[in-house]
């Protein structure tokens, strides 16, 4: 190999050992029969050498550094050449370094031809092995602007006072051009400006200088985004830290075309703007740090550019001004992560503050819009509290558990609407009355409707789930002792048409001691399946529930239990079941922890089933499933 560097070229070539490998045989650079492990060639020198091994790329690397001095004379601006040409260099991993020194008042601009650059974070590497490491200078201090791969959006980087650009090419890479040019600009009065150009939909992840270490104190860095006017951009901060400021405040500033409040100033912890049409700038401003405990300022953020959907130009008014104690959350529904680029899905408040989650609270009118390619990726969860504090005022009062129209008119699917129903302890109880009788969801007879009501205790210490209920059954009402949550859960978009025909009211009624009472009026046509609350986990300790089962005059009811034994083992107390005829008050009592469950029994009149639990030993819980079937009476037994 022969490397000849012209005089005054300000180029130095250094061939040195790369990262040591576990290769058995060492390799050397051979010059006039001398074996060396490092070779430095300066401007005006010409050196002929060979290697002592077949694969020098496994042993050596080559660095070609060109110093460009813009302090003493004119700067050689324009397209930067790879000198010496890669064809003249040995096939080693090579790094071309351009070190440009300039006055503080001179702006330097690196312009990258297509493909543009993509910034990578610590620990990341470029697929093709080609990396661009760019750093700047503040007085004598080197500041890392970032490491970049090909195929991105970064088109220009502007700095002042000097720039160091290192292009790393793997030994096998055929690239023979630098891919960038240098231009001079007027002073940019900041650390640097990075321009990022989007041709179409896509995303870019960018980082503050020195990331993941701290951004230089009291510095300013700007990113300029060029976005086609027909697309929308949203900014989200992926990671940030704030330093301890003595003076001034760390912040980001946006210059958004068309905004009447430019620059728009945000704290790093604020929700960042979204749904921005066209070009915009983002600047990161540091502060004067506390000398004793400076901390670090750093920022990693993502800009997502995508087509505005039909919905993004529509403003939806969600009027919760007449609601009390209600919150509505629009959020992404859980999905498997995809590896390919997925456009963001955001909900925007007042069209500007966009995020993947948004919570609206009662008492105000909210204007929202969507920036999302597919609104089925979002759903809504709503919680409303209906509480009674004064039992004299609430008693016998009824409330409709209805989903407000404004919510149903949003283009996002409702997942859950939960009503928390709160009563004064030991003063009042609750009764739920459905417009259409309800069916309890069981394995034997599952609900197949587009929505269900999930009823559970709302007392924090109590783990009591009454069950899931859907329209089209025999449960006429559900009475519960104390605080509960009733959740309307939807399973299909068609739920709206069905739910709008299924009312549910809650009334506050005088207090009673049982945990729950189900009023059941079976239809002659079908078998009613009923099960104890907390199925699969067991009825809680010392809990009592009842079923009030109506039997029409011309019918007989068959009560059937689906196990021979309850399976409960009591640690303390007794578990028992009472079946009581309502007309005669005749009752049968069964010890659930000892007796076998009754065989199918026939009831000619309305009757009660009451189940009371003991304190069971763990793993031996009380779970009972039974059915009621009506058949016409053949003989009048009255």
């Amino acid at each position: 190999f022969e490397i000849a560097l012209p005089r005054e070229s300000n180029i130095t070539v250094l061939i040195k050992l790369g990262t040591p490998t576990l290769l058995a045989k060492p390799c050397y650079i051979v010059i006039s029969k001398r074996h060396i492990t490092m070779l430095s060639i300066k401007s005006g020198e010409r050196i002929v050498f060979t290697f002592s091994c077949q694969s020098p790329e496994n042993h050596f690397v080559i660095e070609i550094q060109k110093n460009i001095d813009c302090m003493s004379g004119p700067c050689p601006f324009g397209e930067v050449q790879l000198q010496p040409s890669t064809s003249l260099l040995p096939t080693l991993n090579r790094t071309f370094i351009w070190d440009v020194k300039a006055h503080k008042s001179i702006g330097l601009e690196l312009q990258f031809s297509i493909p543009r650059l993509r910034q990578i974070g610590p620990g990341e590497s470029c697929p093709d092995g080609v990396t661009h490491s760019i750093s700047g200078r503040i007085d004598a201090t080197v500041v890392r602007i970032g490491t970049f791969c090909s195929n991105g959006t970064v088109s220009r980087i502007k700095m002042q006072e000097g720039v160091k650009m290192a292009l790393h090419l793997p030994w096998f890479h055929p690239r023979n051009v630098s891919g960038f040019s240098i231009a001079n600009r007027s002073s940019i009065k900041r650390l640097c400006i990075i321009e990022s150009v989007f041709e179409g939909e896509g995303s870019a992840t960018l980082m503050s200088a020195n990331y993941p270490e701290g951004f230089p104190e009291d510095e300013l860095m700007t990113w300029q985004f060029v976005v086609p006017a027909h697309l929308r951009a949203s900014v989200s901060f992926l990671n940030f830290n704030l330093s301890n400021c003595e003076r001034k405040e760390e912040r980001v500033e946006y210059y958004i075309p068309g905004s009447t409040t430019n620059p728009e100033v945000f704290k790093l912890e604020d929700k960042q703007p979204g749904n921005m049409a066209g070009n915009f700038n983002l600047s990161l401003q540091g502060c004067d740090q506390d000398a004793q405990s400076p901390g670090i300022l750093r920022l990693q953020f993502q800009v997502l550019v995508q087509h505005p959907q039909n919905e993004s130009n529509k403003i939806y008014v969600v009027d919760l001004s007449n609601e009390r104690a209600m919150s509505l959350t629009i959020e992404p529904r859980p999905v498997k992560q995809s590896r390919k680029f997925v456009p963001g899905c955001f909900v925007c408040l007042e069209s500007r503050t966009c995020s993947s989650n948004l919570t609206l609270t009662s008492g105000s009118k909210h204007k929202i819009s969507f920036l999302c390619d597919d609104l089925t990726r979002l759903w809504m969860n709503v919680e409303k509290t209906i509480s009674c504090t004064d039992h004299r005022y609430c008693q016998r009062k009824s409330y409709s558990l209805q989903v407000p129209s404004d919510i149903l008119h949003l283009p996002v699917e409702l997942h859950d609407f939960s009503w928390k129903l709160l009563v004064p302890k030991d003063r009042l109880s609750l009764v739920l009355v459905p417009a259409q009788k309800l069916q309890q969801h069981t394995h034997e007879k599952p609900c197949n409707t587009s929505f269900s009501y999930l009823v559970a205790s709302a007392i924090p210490s109590q783990d009591l789930y009454f069950g899931s209920f859907c329209p089209g059954g025999s449960i006429k009402q559900i009475q519960v002792k104390q605080n509960i949550s009733v959740t309307l859960r939807t399973f299909a978009p068609s739920f709206q048409q069905e739910a709008s025909r299924q009312g549910l009211t809650v009334s506050f009624i005088p207090y009673f001691k049982e945990e729950g009472v189900f009023t059941v009026t079976p239809d002659t046509k079908s078998k009613v399946y009923l099960r104890t609350p907390n199925w699969d986990r067991g009825l809680p300790s010392l809990t009592s529930v009842s079923w009030n089962i109506s039997v029409p005059r011309d019918q007989v009811a068959c009560l059937t239990f689906f196990k021979e034994r309850s399976g409960v083992v009591c640690q303390t107390g007794r578990a028992f079941m009472i079946i009581q005829e309502q007309r005669t008050r005749a009752e049968e009592i069964f010890s659930l922890d000892e007796d076998v469950l009754p065989k199918p029994s026939f009831h000619h009149h309305s009757f009660w089933v009451n189940i009371s639990n003991c304190s069971p030993t763990s793993g031996k819980q009380l779970d009972l499933l039974f059915s009621v079937t009506l058949t016409p009476r053949t003989v009048d037994l009255t």
């Epitope: 417009a435 068609s494 048409q497 709008s500 025909r501 009312g503």
Partner: antibody
Framework: EVTLKESGPELKKPGETVKISCKAS????????MNWVKQAPGKDLKFMGW????????TYADDFKGRFDFSLEASASTAFLRINNLKNEDTATYFC???????????????WGQGTTVTVSS | DIVMTQAAASLSVTVGETVTITCRAS??????LAWYQQQQGKSPQLLVY???NLADGVPSRFSGSGSGTHYSLKINSLQSEDFGFYYC?????????FGGGTKLEIK
């Protein structure tokens, strides 16, 4: 503006079949269920049932199970009522009507068609 | 099924008067009640829903009240266009049923 436009009057013989159409406009057809209401001459209104315009599933009131059939052509925003094996007592005006998604408002008949008169006579 | 009863089959009233039409449900319908007006040869028109809410475009002389099983529709200062049939309808479950109607006639 929400409008429901029903097909014209029908004169049929007992045992025949009639199919009435109801074309909706001014709203997203598959968002709201379509109800059907019967009014016999000089009589009160009787709810016949409804069809879920999203799923096509029909629900019939007890008196209208068997000979009555609700169907859809969602792409044309049209609901249909077919009555098979017509009887004299089917002589009536049949209205399609749309509820609202207000609370339990699926059965609150906010919008009505102009009605289709079906006369059954031998 | 829930039975809706309108006690008065007809009422004769003078223009300018105030009239109240009543409706009773066979069980508690929790305010899930609507009122309709129907004029000769026309489709019914919604006046009131949820017992008290006035439908869009309905004059404020109409008002609904009641709870539980008893409901009423009040029309202040009757106009000539108010004459016709009035029906109550519950929408508390399936099937929704209508009252027998009250005919409002000019005296």
């Amino acid at each position: 503006e929400v409008t429901l436009k029903e097909s014209g009057p029908e004169l049929k013989k007992p045992g025949e079949t009639v199919k009435i159409s109801c074309k909706a406009s001014g709203y997203a057809f598959t968002k709201y269920g379509m109800n059907w209401v019967k009014q016999a001459p000089g009589k009160d209104l009787k709810f016949m049932g409804w069809i879920n315009t999203y799923t096509g599933e029909a629900t019939y009131a007890d008196d209208f199970k068997g000979r009555f059939d609700f169907s859809l052509e969602a792409s044309a925003s049209t609901a249909f009522l077919r009555i098979n094996n017509l009887k004299n007592e089917d002589t009536a005006t049949y209205f399609c009507s749309r509820g609202d998604d207000y609370g339990t408002g699926g059965y609150v008949l906010f919008y009505w068609g102009q009605g289709t008169t079906v006369t059954v006579s031998s | 099924d829930i039975v809706m009863t309108q006690a008065a089959a007809s009422l004769s009233v003078t223009v300018g008067e105030t009239v109240t039409i009543t409706c009773r449900a066979s069980e508690n319908i929790y305010n899930n009640l609507a009122w309709y007006q129907q004029q000769q040869g026309k489709s019914p028109q919604l006046l009131v829903y949820a017992a008290t809410n006035l439908a869009d475009g309905v004059p404020s002389r109409f008002s609904g009240s009641g709870s539980g099983t008893h409901y009423s529709l009040k029309i202040n200062s009757l106009q000539s266009e108010d004459f016709g049939f009035y029906y109550c309808q519950h929408f508390w479950g399936t099937p929704p049923t209508f009252g027998g109607g009250t005919k409002l006639e000019i005296k």
